[in-house]
């Protein structure tokens, strides 16, 4: 596919990435799908600088990011290595809490109202952040 050289209209550019911040709420899987349909992915936070950037643009409300452990280990949706990467969990999180009564534990990560991360039930309808990188090949087929 062709390389994306500029951000989609009305997205916010920062450090060669483009960001869109939802104001409605969706379950994690629906938010993930929404971003994919925009040729993007749920935000992957790779540094303290990016953490602060996102935090400054979102409201002080629970907001999904592209991090989950639905298949066992924690994974970023774009393949960024979790173990060696940036983390900003709240104290004693993630805890895979089962006491919510909704069945299962907590497999999806979100920004809390103070920006730090928590794991929660993936079905909760939270806001989300989409991210797409500039200079990466888009998923669109090339024009013939």
């Amino acid at each position: 596919g062709s390389e994306r050289t500029c951000c989609p209209v009305n997205w916010v550019e920062h450090e060669r990435s483009c960001y869109w911040f939802s104001r409605s709420g969706k379950a994690w899987a629906d938010a993930d799908n929404y971003c994919r349909l925009e040729d993007a992915h749920l935000v992957v936070v790779t540094s303290w600088e990016e953490q602060k950037f996102v935090q400054h643009h979102i409201g002080p409300v629970n907001t999904w990011m592209g991090l989950h452990d639905q298949n066992g280990p924690w994974k970023w949706v774009d393949g960024t290595d979790y173990e060696t990467g940036f983390k900003n969990w709240r104290p004693e999180q993630p805890d895979d809490w089962y006491g919510h009564g909704l069945g299962g534990g907590e497999d999806c990560a979100h920004f809390t109202d103070d920006g730090r991360w928590n794991d929660d039930v993936c079905q909760r309808p939270y806001r989300w952040v989409c991210e797409t990188e500039l200079d990466k090949a888009s998923q669109e087929p090339p024009l013939l």
Partner: antibody
Framework: QVQVQQWGAGLLKPSETLSLTCAVY????????WSWIRQPPGKGLEWIGE???????NYNPSLKSRVTISVDTSKNQFSLKLSSVTAADTAVYYC??????????????????WGQGTTVTVSS | DIVMTQSPLSLPVTPGEPASISCRSS???????????LDWYLQKPGRSPQLLIY???NRASGVPERFSGSGSGTDFTLKISRVEAEDVGVYYC?????????FGGGTKVEIK
């Protein structure tokens, strides 16, 4: 200069559905979220909900079960439907421009464009 | 929901004199980005509301310099340095920090 014009039925009977439309002229409809706000006679302002051109909505929980906000991007219009109205829904209804489409809090500049208001009366 | 409380309810003013309206929120409106998410609107008699101040202290386009907003966290103030006859109406504060957006009950400014 961006302008918004709104219209809809002004007199309803209890249990009917309120229906209003707001049209945006002279500015980029797709650049913003758009809100509905209402004001009962002699009272203050109440936010009803918001929508963007993609159809993403956010509703006031106090009205959520009865409210639908929809969009027609081809006409630069968005609409409000409120079902099962009662006398308590009698109010002036306004549409207004608000957050940028990006959703970014850093680019919020207030509700800076308002419609002229539509008076809706619910009476049997 | 965030509760917004305005005072006074009514404010009789003399043209040329200053006026001040208070607004308090039930929780802090200060965002980690440094902005206070508090707007001020004026609704003149028979008209739609109009934006005066956004993000606590920023005057909207075309708003006279006699209007100023201040405050942080939960306590905010709208000041009119010298009231003019055209300033009469109901003033509302509003928080856009969290949905649902919520408004104060309004302060009616009238000429003595």
């Amino acid at each position: 200069q961006v302008q918004v014009q709104q219209w809809g039925a002004g007199l309803l009977k209890p249990s009917e559905t309120l229906s209003l439309t707001c049209a945006v002229y002279g500015g980029s409809f797709t650049d913003y979220y758009w809100s509905w706000i209402r004001q009962p006679p002699g009272k203050g302002l109440e936010w009803i909900g918001e929508i963007n051109h993609s159809g993403d909505t956010n509703y006031n929980p106090s009205l959520k079960s009865r409210v639908t906000i929809s969009v027609d991007t081809s006409k630069n219009q968005f609409s409000l439907k409120l079902s099962s109205v009662t006398a308590a829904d009698t109010a002036v209804y306004y549409c207004a421009r608000e957050f940028p489409y990006s959703g970014s809090y850093l680019y919020y500049y207030g509700m800076d464009v308002w419609g002229q208001g539509t008076t809706v009366t619910v009476s049997s | 929901d965030i509760v917004m409380t305005q005072s006074p309810l009514s404010l009789p003013v003399t043209p040329g004199e200053p006026a001040s309206i208070s607004c308090r929120s039930s929780q802090s409106l200060l965002h980690s980005n440094g902005h206070n998410y508090l707007d001020w609107y004026l609704q003149k008699p028979g008209r739609s509301p109009q934006l005066l101040i956004y993000l606590g202290s920023n005057r909207a386009s075309g708003v006279p310099e006699r209007f100023s907003g201040s405050g942080s966290g939960t306590d905010f103030t709208l000041k009119i340095s010298r009231v003019e006859a055209e300033d009469v109406g109901v003033y509302y504060c509003m928080q856009p920090l969290q949905t649902p957006f919520t408004f104060g009950g309004g302060t009616k400014v009238e000429i003595k």
